[in-house]
Interface confidence: low
């Protein structure tokens, strides 16, 4: 077969297909460039358009910034001339790649600009509690689009020791199942570490005052987190799933995890934080169902049921 010389492959037409795009969540920091990625294939050659919050967005028109638009692609980088320029560009972006056969659309890319994090100034009243009772010291870090790390320390920058009795929750709060007079300190300080901005900020110190009693009263377990009897969660396939139960009581309750709907996937489950956290690596369809935590001590038990629905990522 002889193919005429004038025949070229580009006569075969292909509708656009997005081949590369930024992640759905993108966090930028005050000094970072903003880079949004959108690549697509197609014949005739694909052309690109962006929207921000549903409105036509033209990077090349933005004032006070330098824009580099990659040739033959929808990707662009914006470089600012001041430390806070990223705030201007927060929003939900979408890339459209089109040729005459049609249009392909990227997923929504939520661009979040993190400013320099600050804890609101507040007057922290001393927390007064009787020996043997439970208490929660709140952290409440400023909102952050990026994952941040929480540490509880004292004024000597020593970590607060955690065990079955004293636990930091996923939310950053410090939970005491029951307090001892040895917990009496005026300097419980919550530190928030923002890796992206390489910033550590600290909350005003909390003064925990423990009043001694002659006899500590035994109490059966009660869940401090979650506080209700059941909750429903959606887990994404292939993503990790973290379930948490923190209980109070005296003696200190122990936590057990059960799966009424079937065996616990032992090869993919880890227990952390003195059994208070169950982490399931790479969720699959078979992980759908009920997970139950049981807090027990010599006086009784408390439970929470997590109903997990697994969805495609």
């Amino acid at each position: 077969i002889q193919i005429p010389e004038e025949y070229e492959g580009h006569h075969v037409m292909e509708p656009p297909v997005i081949t590369e795009q930024s992640p759905r969540r993108l966090v930028v920091f005050p000094t970072d460039d903003i880079s949004l990625k959108c690549e697509a294939s197609g014949k005739p050659e694909v052309q690109f358009r962006w929207t921000r919050d549903g409105v036509h967005f033209k990077p090349k028109e933005e004032l006070g910034v330098t824009v580099y638009q990659s040739p033959h692609s929808g990707s662009f980088t914006i470089t600012g001339n001041n430390s806070n320029f990223a705030q201007r560009f927060q929003g939900i972006y979408r890339c459209f790649a089109s040729n005459k056969l049609g249009t392909a659309m990227s997923h929504e890319i939520r661009l979040m600009a993190e400013g320099a994090p600050k804890w609101p100034k507040e007057t922290v009243k001393p927390v007064e509690v009787e020996e043997g009772e439970s208490v929660v010291l709140p952290c409440n870090p400023p909102p952050s689009a990026e994952p941040l790390r929480i540490y509880w320390m004292n004024s000597k920058i020593l970590h607060i020791k955690q065990d079955e009795r004293v636990t930091m929750g996923q939310n950053g709060n410090l939970y005491f199942a029951n307090v001892l007079t040895s917990d009496n300190h005026s300097d419980y300080i919550c530190h928030a570490h923002f890796p992206g901005t390489r910033t550590i900020i600290q909350k005003e110190p909390i003064d925990l005052r423990v009043k001694a009693t002659n006899s500590m009263i035994d109490r059966k377990p009660r869940l401090l987190f979650p506080t209700n009897s059941s909750s429903h969660l959606v887990a994404l396939q292939g993503q990790p799933l973290v379930l948490e139960c923190i209980a109070e009581g005296f003696p200190t309750p122990t936590i057990k995890w059960l799966r009424p709907s079937g065996p616990m996937p032992a090869d993919r489950v880890t227990y952390q934080n003195h059994n208070k956290t169950l982490q399931l690596l790479k969720v699959g369809e078979e992980d759908d169902g009920e997970y139950r935590c049981l807090a027990e001590n010599s006086l009784g038990s408390a439970r929470h049921a997590y109903y997990v629905t697994v969805e495609a990522a």
Epitope: E45, K60, S70, H72, T103
Partner: antibody
Framework: QVQLVQPGDELVKPGASVKLSCKAS????????MQWVKQRPGQGLEWIGE????????NYNEMFKSKAVLSVDKSVSTAYMQLSSLTAEDTAVYYC???????????WGQGTLVTVSS | DIVMTQSPSSLAVSVGERVTMSCKSS????????????LAWYQQKPGQSPKLLIY???TRESGVPDRFSGSGSGTDFTLTISSVKAEDVALYYC?????????FGQGTKLEIK
């Protein structure tokens, strides 16, 4: 800001050729197709064709295939349209227009009036 | 080629009035896979280049006053000016970019009484 600069009027003789230019600035020249549009005096708009500055690829309106040749010079961010065998019918304003992805022409040059007259 | 037909060819209205103009295409401009209509509206004031007002039949170009709106789907489209201002005196063209060659309507001329 984006600018498409076209030269002023051109007076040419019937049968001759003319090469119109469109100098682009304020954006990445190779990232967007350049359109060319004809408007005869008191008439509507006609699409002549388009060129991709990054690789020189063109799409023409069949009506103009034997009349217009589109080209670019990336080194000076300029698009060109050569019109040949000119007749009175070619007397018109010729616009270059930038399109940034959906063919809608969102930046236009100010147009060059070509007058074909002996 | 897709033929674009605009009506009326001209209209005269008073300032503050609502205006609608029509554009019909000989083939559907709706691309089923993304439900977008590949139609744009342009405004051309006397002695000036055309200016993009609307794309995708109903999406206002950034910087265009919200008194301009586009509607319609398939083959029938409308440009509406909710409250005409004197500065809106111009020719208005629709254009399809669904298929090559891209084609324009013959225009609607808007005048003020």
């Amino acid at each position: 800001q984006v600018q498409l600069v076209q030269p002023g009027d051109e007076l040419v003789k019937p049968g001759a050729s003319v090469k119109l230019s469109c100098k682009a600035s304020g954006y990445t020249f190779t990232s967007y197709w350049m359109q060319w549009v004809k408007q005869r005096p008191g008439q509507g708009l006609e699409w002549i064709g388009e060129i991709n500055p990054s690789n020189g690829r063109t799409n023409y309106n069949e009506m103009f295939k034997s009349k217009a040749v589109l080209s670019v010079d990336k080194s000076v961010s300029t698009a060109y349209m050569q019109l040949s065998s000119l007749t009175a019918e070619d007397t018109a304003v010729y616009y270059c227009a930038l399109y940034d992805g959906y063919y809608a022409m969102d930046y236009w040059g100010q147009g060059t009036l070509v007058t074909v007259s002996s | 080629d897709i033929v674009m037909t605009q009506s009326p060819s001209s209209l005269a209205v008073s300032v503050g009035e609502r205006v609608t103009m029509s554009c019909k295409s000989s083939q559907s401009l709706l691309y089923s896979s993304n439900q977008k209509n590949y139609l744009a509206w342009y405004q051309q004031k006397p002695g000036q280049s055309p200016k993009l007002l609307i794309y995708w039949a109903s999406t206002r170009e950034s910087g265009v006053p919200d008194r301009f709106s586009g509607s319609g789907s398939g083959t029938d489209f409308t440009l509406t000016i909710s409250s005409v201002k004197a500065e809106d005196v111009a020719l208005y063209y629709c254009q399809q970019y669904h298929s090559y060659p891209f084609t324009f309507g013959q225009g609607t001329k808007l005048e003020i009484k």
